[in-house]
Amino acid sequence: ETVHCDLQPVGPERGEVTYTTSQVSKGCVAQAPNAILEVHVLFLEFPTGPSQLELTLQASKQNGTWPREVLLVLSVNSSVFLHLQALGIPLHLAYNSSLVTFQEPPGVNTTELPSFPKTQILEWAAERGPITSAAELNDPQSILLRLGQAQGSLSFCMLEASQDMGRTLEWRPRTPALVRGCHLEGVAGHKEAHILRVLPGHSAGPRTVTVKVELSCAPGDLDAVLILQGPPYVSWLIDANHNMQIWTTGEYSFKIFPEKNIRGFKLPDTPQGLLGEARMLNASIVASFVELPLASIVSLHASSCGGRLQTS
């Protein structure tokens, strides 16, 4: 049965979804256990410049000591104001000084990066040490690079399309996800549905997606259901500022009781099927419908509260 609900973009004042993901357009993670230098390469594409970027390097102590020295190669296509956090990490940074400006002195060793194409930059980096990770990111707002975390099965890092960087790299795109909404025809009442569909990633290990939901309305005003659909290896950790009905695939738990796993349901994996679920749950409005790549953290801010849906 076709569900009549014409999904249309929702204005950012009605709903916004941001997310952090390990999925990259191109990337690789390799293991170089005996290397003196841990080499990471980032190719960053910004559609418009100048852009601001927050780049955080995190080191995990190994055998009680800091990891080996790190070379981070930063290749950008346009002007970037960089806020770098790399506390206590023996970091060497290679970058194009005419394109990258630091918001504060980096306090690390720097090297001018030659104006090479991508393949040559990788060769240049590999001459300095085996590459642990390389990734191509489109318009990042923030990046977290975890050092000493490489779980790759490769011994040699070669950029491949559509990769999951695992725990090595997480990033947040600057552009929020497209949020759509619609009215479910023929359903009375003011119950609203927020539907989040996480698409399968390129690495199918068990994953927890943290979903932060912030709805700006008085607690008593809200009759809502949160529908979370993802691949079978995804479980959900929900951090919500309102009580609402939860309808998920896999398993879910709440931030306040993280050890209490609640079994979800096998849900349809199509937009039409998920709209059908919302209807079956007596929602009259789909206040937000979002499809995302496999993410680690998703934040939903909405201000519909069972009121009138406004599409942009």
């Epitope: 068990p206 691949p231 079978p232």
Partner: antibody, heavy 118, light 106 residues
Framework: EVQLVESGGGLVKPGGSLRLSCAAS????????MDWVRQAPGKGLEWVGE??????????YYAESVKGRFTISRDDSKNTLYLQMNSLKTEDTAVYYC?????????WGQGTLVTVSS | DIQLTQSPSSLSASVGDRVTITCRAS?????MHWYQQKPGKAPKPWIY???NLASGVPSRFSGSGSGTDYTLTISSLQPEDFATYYC?????????FGGGTKVEIK
């Protein structure tokens, strides 16, 4: 149509072993999280344990009453679920059902009777 | 573990009667599921997620509740409804079933 058919039940002495099988058809078995539930004669239902899909690393979970004695496994190429039961006790006497969870346990086999008696 | 206590454990009723079975959880659960079982047969899925009827279940059945208290109601008992009904939760591991309520003919 979903079909689950259990086999392998029978009479076994306390301390003995038995392996139950459950042949599945009519759905994508490799994606399914599969469970065993048992029912002692004249008693209620008791969850035994579960095995998840390959995507979830075939993770297994067990009821406290069978932990360390029972092992759930699966062969996705044969669409078959297994329950290996070791160190059997008289209180393990029951009809054993294999079942799959979608909205809840919405598909059940017909069950196979396991009798543990000396 | 979350204990589920069903009451009554058995009841006698006549065709056409309204019947209510309750299931009380020892701590709050998100959803309650219900199964129907007839002698010598496997349980049948009956009501899922508190109030949703499984495929083929007549509309005289309904489910409701939240927190720790849940009910299954038969608005007008029919001959084919005489069976044992079990509630079940999976809001906390391990999954648990109620002890069952046997609905018998008066």
């Amino acid at each position: 149509e979903v079909q689950l058919v259990e086999s392998g039940g029978g009479l076994v002495k306390p301390g003995g072993s038995l392996r139950l099988s459950c042949a599945a058809s009519g759905f994508t078995f490799s994606d399914a999280w599969m469970d065993w539930v048992r029912q002692a004669p004249g008693k209620g239902l008791e969850w035994v344990g579960e095995i998840r899909s390959k995507a979830s690393n075939h993770a297994t979970y067990y009821a406290e009453s069978v932990k360390g004695r029972f092992t759930i496994s699966r062969d996705d190429s044969k669409n078959t679920l297994y329950l290996q039961m070791n160190s059997l006790k008289t209180e393990d006497t029951a009809v054993y059902y294999c079942t799959t969870w979608r909205r809840f346990f919405d598909s059940w086999g017909q069950g196979t009777l396991v009798t543990v008696s000396s | 573990d979350i204990q589920l206590t069903q009451s009554p454990s058995s009841l006698s009723a006549s065709v056409g009667d309204r019947v209510t079975i309750t299931c009380r959880a020892s701590s709050s659960v998100s959803y309650m599921h219900w199964y129907q079982q007839k002698p010598g047969k496997a349980p049948k899925p009956w009501i899922y997620a508190t109030s949703n009827l499984a495929s083929g279940v007549p509309s005289r059945f309904s489910g409701s509740g939240s927190g720790t208290d849940y009910t299954l109601t038969i608005s007008s008992l029919q001959p084919e409804d005489f069976a044992t009904y079990y509630c079940q939760q999976w809001s906390s591991n391990p999954l648990t079933f109620g002890g069952g309520t046997k609905v018998e003919i008066k």
